[in-house]
């Protein structure tokens, strides 16, 4: 028995057709993606293949401004024009609160939502019950499928899930649901989840009875033969697994941002074990043509993106210095404010030892394009933002080495004095430079906000310890020449979209007026 | 809406066999198991079996199994339940239920059918 | 197989009184429990599923709890209507399983 498995993951909001960066379409013969390009590929899909399902392996929220403006309800509504068979909670599907889950999204979906490692409890469980499931048995075809979910257990660190969820061990809560699948003589399970590419492995692996990942979260890219566009596979498409009871798991994920349409055919026995599989992601490019009722659809509800984005988030009364001429060359109130936006967006008072886990902030001065001028009424709009933040990138959370950090901070002024974008603004944090040194050595004080203290203080940075950092996407990934902090990472997690936290940050304040304050000093 | 209608009162003797049908409307047939839950008089319940309609896959009570068969009809979205080898003690009401294949609680229920062993 | 232990067997109670029936369950059986009610001579009725999920139509006063192995059915304030008896049932591990009944009276 033929099974087609059709996947997405980390869509992160782009409803509409992407460039190849997977940012704001520009010419549209060259995009990429969109609901209405993916609708296409599945129907063709569908029409010629028996038995096929179609899953999503979380985060469909936050990303651009579709998810500012309709707040998932898109993401319902599109996901159930697609008819989606099943979706798994991922951590930013929380960004909003468990309200800003269960009304727009689990109340809406016409598919089950999964997560076997959530469990709710006090007020919030009887209003939340039955509207995710740890699993669903879906009939394909003469045969049935259970499918598992489970959801990142950082994600109270990484979104906003509130007081009342627990986030369990993935394998721990597995198990027992997979055991439960067995029971009801379910003997063709798939593990659909967002706990990123390492833990698909490790559930592969551990996890008695699943017989195939679908992942998400770490944006992994698998590939057999030559890839199609620009992203580099980080191994074959599917990635086998061998569990400890010595059967083969594939284990799949298919990049991110709707850019390509995970394509996975397994082959079962009638004892419902894998014999083979095989596949490849499909990219999603403009040979494959919109599907012209999704596409008059996402242009009705795009009608109200373009209102938005004119409408006041906020005022500033000073001028908010986002210039090259500052940004790149000293520490710029444009800056700050975007710094002081990510780390408030990171508040998460988790354990009574820390007032957060996270306080500190990097930001490379090239990703700040415009400055705002404060005499147009002091008006803030997502326009003037999307001048400012222009390439749509996040705001991710990483774990660094104190040595890694140093590193980051000597690069940042390697060749000062050029314009060159890799000069570093902060928050939570203090450096001293001293440009007479010779480049590599050119950092004389590194002091950084305590986390682990009631009352915030600046402390010198230790190099062997391990701090948590707010930065772009862009630094993540060693943009900019910050190779270091890519090849010496010890965890990223995908943010929130870069203008969406300022955005937010501004609306909540109301009334901003950054301040240069000394957090960059040159001796 | 909803409904789960089965056939009528039976008396059966001792070692015979009886078959109760149960039809189904209101709902997709195919989507969900109808389960049989006995109930003898003034007694408690006792869950027998199920059958997925959707593609014949049956769940026993390993207590019945060898004495009952669950066949089904989707061309008339009926159920059947035919209980062999009857003794006096299978004198109950046999009731049919709708449940999710995949969480098996009951949520319809069918009126019951009263199977009287009596020699 | 499960057993699901339900208790009192009977009690008797009136009108406004908040009545708790308990089902022990005898391993964990991960909250898939539900809850029905039966009066003489009709086919049960399912009140709740999932320990606390209230079935559409079932009033606000019949609420559940518990984890684990313990489960408890709570009837806020009893009515009229409410006089019948109760069964719990397990859906974690076939066979599927019944408590034996609580028989509600009226005192």
């Known amino acids: 028995w033929e099974l087609t498995i059709l996947h997405t993951n980390d869509v992160h909001s782009r409803l509409e057709q992407t460039s190849e960066d997977s940012s704001k379409c520009v010419n549209a013969s060259r995009c990429m993606g969109g609901v209405a390009r993916l609708f296409t590929k599945v129907q063709q899909i569908r029409r010629a293949e028996p038995n096929v399902l179609l899953l999503d392996a979380g985060d469909q929220y936050q990303g651009t401004i579709w998810f500012t403006v309709y707040k998932g309800a898109e993401v319902a509504h599109f996901m159930n024009a697609l008819r989606y068979d099943a979706m798994a909670l991922g951590n930013h599907e929380f960004d909003n609160g468990v309200e800003g889950l269960i009304e727009p999204l689990l109340k809406e979906a016409k598919f089950p939502i999964l997560s076997a490692n959530i469990k709710a409890k006090g007020p919030l469980a009887s209003q939340i019950s039955g509207l995710y499931l740890p699993y669903k048995v879906l009939p394909v075809g003469d045969e049935v499928v259970g499918i598992v979910g489970y959801t990142s257990k950082e994600t109270p660190f990484l979104s906003n899930p509130g007081t009342n969820l627990v986030f369990e061990d993935e394998i721990t809560a597995l198990q027992p649901e997979v055991d439960k699948l067995k029971t009801l003589n379910v003997n063709k399970i798939i593990a659909l989840g967002h706990s990123g590419f390492e833990m698909d492995k490790l559930i592969a692996q551990k996890v008695r009875g699943v017989d195939v990942v679908v992942g998400g979260h770490s944006n992994t890219f698998l590939y057999t033969g030559n890839p199609p566009s620009k992203e580099v596979p980080a191994g074959k498409y599917p990635f086998i697994v061998t569990s400890d009871d010595g059967r083969k798991v594939p284990v799949v994920q298919a990049y991110a941002f709707g850019k390509y349409l995970g394509y996975l055919k397994i082959e079962f026995d009638e004892r419902g074990n894998v014999i083979s599989s095989h596949g490849n992601p499909i990219l999603l490019n403009s040979s494959i043509p919109e599907d012209p009722s999704i596409k008059a659809d996402i242009n009705k509800w795009r009608i109200k993106l373009d209102n938005y984005s004119t409408q006041e988030l906020g005022k500033t009364i000073v001028y908010l210095d986002g210039s090259s001429q500052s940004c790149r060359f000293r520490e710029c109130n444009m800056g700050n404010l975007i710094c002081d936006a990510m780390i408030n967006n990171n508040l998460r008072h988790t354990d009574e030892m820390f007032w957060n886990h996270v306080s500190m902030c990097i930001l490379n001065g090239g990703g700040i394009r415009s400055p705002i001028d404060e005499r147009n009424n002091g008006t803030i709009t997502w326009e003037n933002l999307a001048a400012v933040l222009p390439f749509g990138g996040t705001f991710d959370l990483v774990q660094l080495k104190g040595s890694t950090l140093k590193k980051a901070f000597e690069h940042s002024v390697h060749r000062y004095g050029q314009s060159t974008g890799e000069f570093l603004q902060v928050g939570g944090i203090h450096v001293v430079y001293d440009l007479s040194r010779k480049p590599g050595d050119r950092v004389v004080k590194l002091d950084v906000l305590c986390t682990k203290c009631r009352v915030p203080s600046y402390d010198p940075l230790k190099m062997d310890e391990v701090y948590k950092v707010i930065l772009p996407n862009f630094l993540a990934n060693g943009g900019d020449g910050f190779q270091m902090i890519k090849d010496e990472l010890l965890r990223h997690d995908s943010g929130d979209q870069d203008i969406n936290v300022v955005s937010t940050y501004i609306s909540k304040m109301k009334v901003i007026y950054p301040a240069v304050e000394g957090r960059i000093k040159f001796s | 809406q909803v409904q789960l209608v089965q056939s009528g009162a039976e008396v059966k003797k001792p070692g015979a066999s009886v078959k109760v049908s149960c039809k189904a409307s209101?709902?997709?047939?195919?989507?969900?198991?109808i389960h049989w839950v006995r109930q003898a008089p003034g007694q408690g319940l006792e869950w027998m079996g199920a059958i997925f309609p959707g593609n014949g896959h049956i769940s026993y009570n390993q207590k019945f199994k060898g004495r009952v068969t669950m066949t089904v009809d989707t061309s008339t979205s009926t159920v059947y339940m035919e209980l062999s080898s009857l003794r006096s003690e299978d004198t109950a009401v046999y009731y049919c239920?709708?449940?999710?294949?995949?969480?098996?609680?009951?949520?319809?229920w069918g009126q019951g059918t009263l199977v009287t062993v009596s020699s | 197989d499960i057993q699901m232990t339900q208790s009192p067997s009977s009690l008797s109670a009136s009108v406004g009184d908040r009545v708790t029936i308990t089902c022990k369950a005898s391993?964990?059986?991960?909250?898939?429990l539900a809850w029905y009610q039966q009066k003489p001579g009709k086919a049960p009725k399912l009140l709740l599923s999932g320990v606390i999920s209230l079935e559409t139509g079932v009033p606000s006063r019949f609420s559940g709890s518990g984890s684990g192995k313990d489960y408890t059915l709570t009837i806020s304030s009893l009515q009229p209507e409410d006089f019948a008896t109760y069964y719990c049932?397990?859906?974690?591990?076939?066979?599927?399983?019944f408590g034996g009944g609580t028989k509600v009276e009226i005192k």
């Open positions: 391993e964990g059986i991960y909250n898939r």
């Open positions: 239920a709708r449940g999710d294949y995949d969480e098996s609680y009951f949520d319809y």
């Open positions: 049932q397990q859906y974690w591990s076939i066979p599927w399983t």
């Open positions: 209101g709902y997709t047939f195919t989507t969900y198991n």
